[in-house]
């Protein structure tokens, strides 16, 4: 049960009391008002939202609620001057060329300022050459395709579907190969559920739609201008061929009907096999270059896109805490969409909106938290999660001394089917405590408990009667606390079966479509799942900053870290020769895990026993459970990825989106069997598991008696 | 160094099953597709499938009407070839071979004979 | 199904001499064919791809050309461990196939 005795006024006035307060009526009200007119970052439109917002929560009744902007690199289409790819022929005619917009919803057709399909940060240029299907062109598509079917995309333009990894990692992967261009398409075969109708009729990807979408490879920084530290008014600028993570060549989104017309023509090799083939009617011919008839003809990119440094604004409320207010809940997701953002951010957005309310509500009645809550608006995570990173840069030293835990809330929803969670090891009992007490909205699950529901759809694969929770990757706004800073950090929303929808994300992403109609008829008509979000979020908001002992359990980390051991163990097992040749031990790493182990156990013994009526002991205890998570930070961070400093878990290299757990050992194993130097190779592994050692040793001391 | 590595020859009675084994060794066998190839005696090679070890998804020749069936064992980096309803044309050795169209690396071929 | 035809079905040739086989494409495959040799007893070996890029450890004397359906494989100075059955593959179109072999005798 939840222990909220730290502050009320009233007894009534405690976690029940929060989430009763929550109404999805309000979240469907909040959707309504902020999906009516795009609020693309660095746009007027975007400020009024702002200020907007900033005057709501204060008349929810937070104690402060103040902008912060800073001027970043930003990147929009040239209005005139408009991008789109072409196939030529022989004479340099344009025979063919792609949709300059997507066709409007209906209801929508005279609302102005809706950006056409781009990929952000896109150098300009007008490339031309043979075309290459590189499949997903993740990094084992490229593999295939140089090692195995010897296709050199040195000089050639090369189209890859969206989905399976984040398409700023395509974009990388491309550059890599030699391409001089990528064309980013949405196959069906990913965006398009059978037995669904295309909108508006229905869920599904039209031919004509478009995901739009940074392709920046940052990882981590920030402005691409000012990694490390803030965009604020006397920041140093790096110069544009200094600026972090741009890529060096054009990139262009398509839907499939244009896709169609240019993977129709392809020549050269067949797919390698039916993993490479979407379900578009064209052989999915790998290239390079048109065939036969069509061998004359090639693709020409017309990219006249610009970098432009821009204002944006983060909303940041302050619910002052009553007993610690230098200890800091964060509640965040941003505000800033590509079009109308009916799903992304929006629906996150609501959610925040009415948790903020209900908060607001209970402090007009005299109640105040344990703990200060920050809640915030963060602009222009769409362009590489700019918002949040700014003000975690301009704001760190505080944070790293004072932030107990980040809970992100952008999407509500990717899905009706079942919850899903990403967090830390700490928030495993959280969730679970927290999902026990709510009711499921599932049909069929009618009196039973979101834990319950949540189990049965998504099982644990490790632990039979639990549900499954992710690990944390990144491509949104908790990275900076979670992979920088070390700070606790969890997220949840309501997703697809992923194992009856195996397209990728859900069809409409960043498409014009994603309007306020998608989820109110085909998604959430009632906005029970919204509802089930917004309590599943301000839930652990509400525990996080009132539970007198911090809602954290080491133990559970003791787990997973052991669990980790023996994956990346498993790993380099399969290179048993070499291991031995390069006397590769992990002893100290096992060692390390079961020291923290015991230390843990030990800890988690003290934890109940511990006099709590004492604050000083009581301060004591939550610092070393607030300062865990930071201890697994390592200062000097990940090899060429000094913003990513988490020793057990990173984004993985070779996809944004996903976490790795230790990551500094993951990628010094990877691919080794190619370097060409075996003996640094392996010595690289000898020294990365060394830093894991050491570090999870240092954590474990951390939860040791202080003296 | 790269191998692959096929079971031993086999005498099979028409109407029979033969199911053949290629193990991987050297390289990550999920990297890479694995693909059969089989010679009858003093023909042309002929590709029956293959098989992305990764994801255990086969594309088949059509030729062989869903008499093929090829699996693998990424546990045990080793993929299998299983041909059914046999007949006597269908003596010949039975190559699994790396890559994905093109074939740089083969295993030593196993001798399927079919008679009754 | 694309059919690969090779001619001439066997050949023989003296040491030193240019040899040329050919292999025709029922349908246009653009450039991709490739080329194996197969010695007595022994598995095929990978010699060029893309019609005409040699593979790793493969003597320049061997060389390919074509696209569309005609495709040349040349020795340009034959030697006696050349001699081997020679196939072409497709690799545009599933099914994969490979041409009836060119069987290469020395005189």
């Known amino acids: 049960k939840s222990s909220n005795e730290a502050t009320n006024i009233t007894p009534k006035h405690n976690m029940k009391a929060f989430l009763d307060e929550l109404k999805a009526e309000n979240i469907k009200k909040f959707l309504y008002n902020f999906t009516q007119i795009p609020h693309l970052a660095g746009t007027e439109q975007n400020f009024q939202l702002a200020k907007q917002i900033q005057s709501q929560w204060k008349e929810f009744g937070l104690d402060s609620v103040e902008l912060a902007h800073y001027d970043v690199l930003l990147s929009y289409p040239n209005k005139t001057h408009p991008n789109y790819i072409s196939i030529i022929n022989e004479d340099g005619n344009e025979i063919f060329n792609t949709s300059l917009f997507e066709p409007p919803p209906p209801g929508y057709e005279n609302v102005s300022d809706i950006v056409p399909p781009f990929s952000a940060f896109s150098p300009q240029g007008m490339p031309e050459g043979d075309l290459v299907y590189v499949n997903y062109a993740r990094t084992e598509d490229f593999f295939k395709l140089e090692r195995d079917m010897k296709i050199n995309c040195s000089g050639k333009i090369v189209i890859a579907r969206y989905g399976k990894v984040f398409r700023g990692n395509k974009v990388k992967n491309a550059q890599l190969a030699g391409a001089k261009g990528v064309i980013l398409y949405s196959d069906p075969a990913d965006y398009f559920a059978p037995g669904v109708k295309s909108y508006p009729d229905g869920w599904n990807l039209p031919g004509g739609g478009v995901q739009r979408g940074n392709i920046l490879n940052l990882n981590g920084a920030g402005d691409p201008l000012t990694p490390g530290y803030p965009a604020n008014e006397y920041a140093y600028r790096r110069g544009i061929a200094e600026a972090v993570g741009l890529p060096s060549i054009p990139v262009h989104p398509i839907g499939y009907y244009d896709a169609q017309k240019l993977l129709e023509k392809m020549g050269g090799s067949a797919p390698p096999d039916s993993s490479w083939r979407g379900s578009l009617k064209v052989p999915y011919n790998v290239g390079p270059g048109f065939t036969g008839n069509f061998s004359t003809q090639k693709v020409k990119m017309h990219i006249h896109s610009t970098n432009e440094v821009t204002r944006i604004y983060n909303v940041i409320g302050t619910l002052r805490g009553a007993v610690e207010p230098d200890r800091y809940v964060i509640l965040g997701g941003h505000r800033d969409s590509w079009v109308f953002g009916g799903i992304d951010p929006q629906s996150g957005a609501a959610v925040v909106h009415e948790i903020v309310r209900s908060f607001g509500t209970l402090k007009k009645e005299g109640w105040r938290p344990r703990r200060t809550i920050l809640f915030a608006s963060w602009d222009a995570e769409e362009f590489g999660l700019l918002g949040s990173t700014e003000w975690a840069e301009e704001n760190s030293r505080l944070l790293q001394e004072r932030g107990v835990a980040y809970i992100n809330a952008d999407s509500s929803i990717e899905g009706n089917y079942t919850l899903r969670v990403d967090c830390t090891p700490l928030m495993y009992s959280l969730v679970h405590n927290l999902t026990k007490e709510l009711k499921s909205p599932d049909e069929g699950f009618e009196g039973k408990s979101l834990y319950e529901s949540w189990t049965k759809k998504s099982p644990s694969p490790e632990f039979s009667g639990m549900p499954r929770i992710s690990k944390l990757g990144s491509g949104n706004d908790f990275e900076v606390f979670f992979q920088r800073l070390g700070i606790a950090s969890g997220r949840a929303r309501y997703t697809k079966n992923w194992e009856t929808n195996k397209f990728s994300g859900y069809p409409l992403y960043h498409s014009v479509y994603e309007t306020y109609e998608l989820v109110e008829k085909f998604y959430d008509p009632m906005f029970k799942y919204h509802l089930t979000v917004a309590q599943v979020r301000g839930g652990m908001v509400f525990e996080l900053a009132n539970s007198i002992v911090l809602p954290f359990d080491c133990r559970d980390y003791a787990v997973v870290l052991r669990k980790y051991a023996d994956k990346i163990y498993s790993i380099s097992m399969k290179h048993p020769q070499e291991m031995k040749t390069y006397s590769v031990s992990f002893d100290s790493l096992f060692s390390a895990v079961k020291n923290f182990t015991e230390i843990a156990s030990k800890f988690s013994e003290r934890l109940q026993d511990f006099d709590k009526s004492n604050p000083i002991v009581l301060r004591m205890m939550n610092d070393q459970l607030m300062f865990l998570e930071r201890a697994f930070i390592d200062p000097l961070g990940l090899p060429d990825r000094p913003f990513y400093r988490h020793v057990i878990y990173a984004p993985s290299s070779h996809n944004k989106y996903a976490g790795e757990s230790f990551p500094g050992i993951y990628d010094a194993l990877f691919d080794i069997e190619s370097k060409v130097d075996p003996s640094k190779a392996w010595g690289e592994v000898k020294r990365q598991i060394y830093v894991a050692a050491f570090t999870v040793q240092a954590a474990a001391e951390t939860l040791s008696e202080v003296a | 160094e790269f191998q692959l590595v096929q079971s031993g020859a086999e005498v099979k009675k028409p109407g029979a099953s033969v199911k053949v084994s290629c193990k991987a060794s050297g390289y990550s066998f999920t990297d890479h597709n694995m693909n059969w190839v089989r010679q009858a005696p003093g023909q042309r090679l002929e590709w029956m499938g293959l098989i992305n070890p990764n994801y255990g998804t086969a594309d088949y020749n059509q030729k062989f009407k869903g008499r093929v069936t090829i699996t693998r064992d990424t546990s045990a980096s080793t993929a299998y070839m299983e041909l059914s309803s046999l007949r006597s044309e269908d003596t010949a050795v039975y190559y699994c071979a790396r890559g994905s169209s093109l074939f740089a690396y083969w295993g030593q071929g196993t001798l399927v004979t079919v008679s009754s | 199904d694309i059919q690969m035809t090779q001619s001439p079905s066997s050949l023989s040739a003296s040491v030193g001499d240019r040899v040329t086989i050919t292999c025709k494409a029922s349908?246009?495959?653009?450039?991709?064919v490739a080329w194996y040799q197969q010695k007595p007893g022994k598995v095929p070996k990978l010699l060029i791809y893309w019609a005409s890029t040699r593979h790793t450890g493969v003597p320049s004397r061997f060389s390919g050309s074509g696209s569309g359906t005609d495709f040349t494989l040349t020795i340009s100075s034959l030697q006696p461990e050349d001699v081997a059955t020679y196939y072409c593959q497709q690799y545009s179109r599933y099914p994969l196939t490979f041409g009836q072999g060119t069987k290469l005798e020395i005189k």
């Open positions: 349908q246009g495959v653009d450039t991709a």
